[in-house]
């Protein structure tokens, strides 16, 4: 990895297993201010592999609300607007970091957690298995 | 919002703006142990809106490596394997949380940051604009 020269103004760490436990400022800095808010708002409907969005809420997690995509069809929508079962709608998944309250119900103590979320769906050519 | 009963064993917080700054344990708990590691490994190639994955590295960020999807085509791949420009390949984007070292180069002090990443691509019917 890349060695980072340490800033002398860093907070102290008493932790021998440093940096296992760190201080995190929850005032979120949003780097997306210049993005177009319409960027993907209707793709779930216009895609050839359309999806629905389901709300997943967990008060012990930060962020507490995550939206999960579920593909509407097994196949993909063709030019006639019908489902073509020779193609497959599949979820595009991504691992994301969330904060899990630990110990439970503590407002200022968390543990990093990696969860898998489905972000949307894409249309793929199926893998055809030929039986000998 | 939901009120969480406070656990009496929680760490103390001296911060008046509590919980602006919190303690986070970086020993990641991975909830995805039963997921198939190949889950979407080849969708980028098999999709009708295929994409390339580009490595984005930033030592001041945690995680330091993020993979960004870039759609290969402006159109989508049709049944003949050609690009159909009557359809559009578009990136599916998601806002994710990352930790940004703050002050810079500090190993144990972070700020939450929201960034927009392209996870993959999907094929959509374009919005056709009729000129009067």
């Amino acid at each position: 990895g890349i060695t980072i020269p340490r800033n002398p103004g860093c907070p102290n760490s008493e932790d021998k297993n440093f940096p296992r436990t760190v201080m995190v400022n929850l005032n979120i800095h949003n780097r997306n201010t210049n993005t177009n808010p319409k960027r993907s708002s209707d793709y779930y409907n216009r895609s050839t592999s359309p999806w629905n969005l389901h709300r997943n809420e967990d008060p012990e997690r930060y962020p507490s609300v995550i939206w999960e995509a579920k593909c509407r069809h097994l196949g993909c929508i063709n030019a006639d607007g019908n489902v073509d079962y020779h193609m497959n709608s599949v979820p595009i998944q991504q691992e994301i970091l969330v904060l899990r309250r630990e110990p439970p119900h503590c407002p200022n103590s968390f543990r990093l957690e990696k969860i898998l979320v489905s972000v949307g769906c894409t249309c793929v050519t199926p893998i055809v298995h030929h039986v000998a | 919002g939901i009120t969480i009963p406070r656990n009496p064993g929680c760490p103390n917080s001296e911060d008046k703006n509590f919980p602006r700054t919190v303690m986070v344990n970086l020993n990641i708990h991975n909830r995805n142990t039963n997921t198939n590691p190949k889950r979407s490994s080849d969708y980028y190639n098999r999709s009708t809106s295929p994409w390339n994955l580009h490595r984005n590295e930033d030592p001041e960020r945690y995680p330091s490596v993020i993979w960004e999807a870039k759609c290969r085509h402006l159109g989508c791949i049709n049944a003949d394997g050609n690009v159909d420009y009557h359809m559009n390949s578009v990136p599916i984007q998601q806002e994710i949380l990352v930790l940004r070292r703050e002050p810079p180069h500090c190993p144990n002090s972070f700020r939450l940051e929201k960034i927009l990443v392209s996870v993959g691509c999907t094929c959509v019917t374009p919005i056709v604009h009729h000129v009067a």
């Epitope: 210049n34 993005t35 177009n36 319409k38 960027r39 993907s40 | 994409w51 390339n52 580009h54 960004e68 870039k70 759609c71 290969r72 085509h73 402006l74 159109g75 690009v83 420009y85 009557h86 559009n88 390949s89 578009v90 990136p91 392209s118 959509v124 374009p126 919005i127 056709v128 604009h129």
Partner: nanobody
Framework: EVQLVESGGRLVQAGGSLRLSCAAS????????MGWFRQAPGKEREFVAA????????AYADFVRGRFTISRDDARNTVYLHMTSLKPEDTAVYYC??????????????????WGQGTQVTVSS
């Protein structure tokens, strides 16, 4: 914000070649499909060429296909338009644009959120 600056336009003889450059600064350049448009005196701005985010695919207007080539160099944050076999009717101000909304087809002008100031190309017969 993204700033786009075009260069490379000049007076050239019919049949000649030119390479236009579009240098981008600001937000991450590689996040965008890019396009070239042109506007001749008294005419509407029209699509010339576009390139995908990855650089693997390009699309062209019928009137430049086979003569013009669009490419991108993400390391230099630059998009190029290589123009050959130039004709007097190619005379126009050429504009570089970055597409961020993806709401229509790649050649629809309103899909492009960021624009340069343009560079003048004049083809004499």
């Amino acid at each position: 914000e993204v700033q786009l600056v075009e260069s490379g336009g000049r007076l050239v003889q019919a049949g000649g070649s030119l390479r236009l450059s579009c240098a981008a600064s600001g937000r991450t350049f590689t996040s965008y499909p890019m396009g070239w448009f042109r506007q001749a005196p008294g005419k509407e701005r029209e699509f010339v060429a576009a390139i995908s985010m990855s650089g693997d695919d390009a699309a062209y207007a019928d009137f430049v296909r086979g003569r013009f080539t669009i490419s991108r160099d993400d390391a230099r944050n630059t998009v190029y338009l290589h123009m050959t076999s130039l004709k007097p009717e190619d005379t126009a101000v050429y504009y570089c644009a970055a597409r961020t909304s993806y709401d229509g087809t790649y050649d629809y002008i309103d899909d492009y959120s960021y624009w340069g100031q343009g560079t003048q190309v004049t083809v004499s017969s």
